[in-house]
């Protein structure tokens, strides 16, 4: 069987939505009303990896696009990017580690920890309209907590 994938949207703990900013970047900003249709819909795939009740390994692709969030070193720093893949081969159960995030849910908060770079998380800035990035600190200025809204496939 193919890997199971479910469609969802994400909002950070300040209720900012995620939208495309150019072909290979996401940004976070407050949306309402009709503008909500701009938000990115992810195809979240349940992939192979270490799993517990609170921690589930997932890959985050953009729905109906051959783009996946991935974590790579750039200038010696873990960096979040949107990576183009061959749609014939993705998604798959055994995703390369750079595509894998540990979806961690504790006390009403959802975090996405890079499997490739432990303790680095998908993050947004407090400021509006800034890029979504990989951050190495939790509980500081930057936001690492999200909510997830599942949508019909």
């Amino acid at each position: 069987a193919p890997v199971r994938s479910l469609n969802c949207t994400l909002r950070d703990s300040q209720q900012k939505s995620l939208v495309m900013s150019g072909p290979y970047e996401l940004k976070a900003l407050h949306l309402q009303g009709q503008d909500m249709e701009q938000q990115v819909v992810f195809s979240m795939s349940f992939v192979q990896g270490e799993e517990s009740n609170d921690k589930i390994p997932v890959a985050l692709g953009l729905k109906e696009k051959n783009l996946y969030l991935s974590c790579v070193l750039k200038d010696d720093k873990p960096t979040l990017q949107l990576e183009s893949v061959d749609p014939k081969n993705y998604p798959k159960k055994k995703m390369e580690k750079r595509f894998v995030f540990n979806k961690i849910e504790i006390n009403n908060k959802l975090e996405f920890e890079s499997a490739q770079f432990p303790n680095w998380y998908i993050s947004t800035s407090q400021a509006e309209n800034m890029p979504v990035f990989l951050g190495g600190t939790k509980g500081g200025q930057d936001i690492t907590d999200f909510t997830m809204q599942f949508v019909s496939s």
Partner: antibody, heavy 119, light 107 residues
Framework: EVQLVESGGGVVQPGRSLRLSCSAS????????MSWVRQAPGKGLEWVAY????????YYPDSVKGRFTISRDNSKNTLFLQMDSLRAEDTGVYYC????????????WGQGTPVTVSS | DIQMTQSPSSLSASVGDRVTITCRAS??????LAWYQQTPGKAPKLLIY???TLMDGVPSRFSGSGSGTDYTFTISSLQPEDIATYYC?????????FGQGTKLQIT
């Protein structure tokens, strides 16, 4: 023994609100995703709301989106369904069920609470 | 959305009979299927998940099989207490949807 006990159903006029509760016991509530499933009179089953074990993930079908809100209080082992702008087609028995998105199936169910929307 | 079509919608059988209910999905659901039993005035009860895995405590006369889009639920020897409506439900993607039900009666 797992127990799910719903309450809060009743007769309400169209456009009004109702809040359902589900009290859980016999399992570690905070470790389980929960859902509400409804059954219109003489009809089949419809999944109407889902919340993940910590409360950070939710789902609503288009039929209730924007009108229903699911929430939970893990400290009190209680699940809620706030139903606003009720319509006649929301009439039915509402079941609290354990399970949802990740496992997919519903392995424990409450006895149900009836909701009637009528003028 | 994936639609689930159950057949028959109702059936009558005698105690001891072998009873079969089928469920067809409008798309491949890769075995992500559950079967429920609902007796009159009661909540549904999960019998089978992942198309063929029996829940703990469910009698072995109940079984499930199938793959792709076509699934079967079987009661090998019908008992009086099996009088109920049976529902299939897929959970391959969102929304998880139920079949319309099969009402089982004893002749």
């Amino acid at each position: 023994e797992v127990q799910l006990v719903e309450s809060g159903g009743g007769v309400v006029q169209p456009g009004r609100s109702l809040r359902l509760s589900c009290s859980a016991s016999g399992f570690i509530f905070s470790k389980y995703d929960m859902s509400w499933v409804r059954q219109a009179p003489g009809k089949g089953l419809e999944w109407v709301a889902y919340i993940s074990h910590g409360g950070a993930g939710t789902y609503y079908p288009d039929s209730v989106k924007g009108r229903f809100t699911i929430s939970r209080d893990n400290s009190k082992n209680t699940l809620f369904l706030q139903m606003d702008s009720l319509r006649a087609e929301d009439t039915g028995v509402y079941y609290c069920a354990r399970g949802g998105v990740y496992k997919g199936y519903f392995d424990e169910w409450g006895q149900g609470t009836p909701v009637t929307v009528s003028s | 959305d994936i639609q689930m079509t159950q057949s028959p919608s109702s059936l009558s059988a005698s105690v001891g009979d072998r009873v079969t209910i089928t469920c067809r999905a409008s798309g491949n659901i890769y075995g992500w299927l559950a079967w429920y039993q609902q007796t009159p005035g009661k909540a549904p009860k999960l019998l089978i998940y992942q198309a063929k895995t029996l829940m703990d405590g469910v009698p072995s006369r109940f079984s499930g099989s199938g793959s792709g889009t076509d699934y079967t639920f079987t009661i090998s020897s019908l008992q009086p207490e099996d009088i109920a409506t049976y529902y299939c439900q897929h959970f391959w993607n969102i929304p998880a949807t139920f079949g319309q039900g099969t009402k089982l009666q004893i002749t």
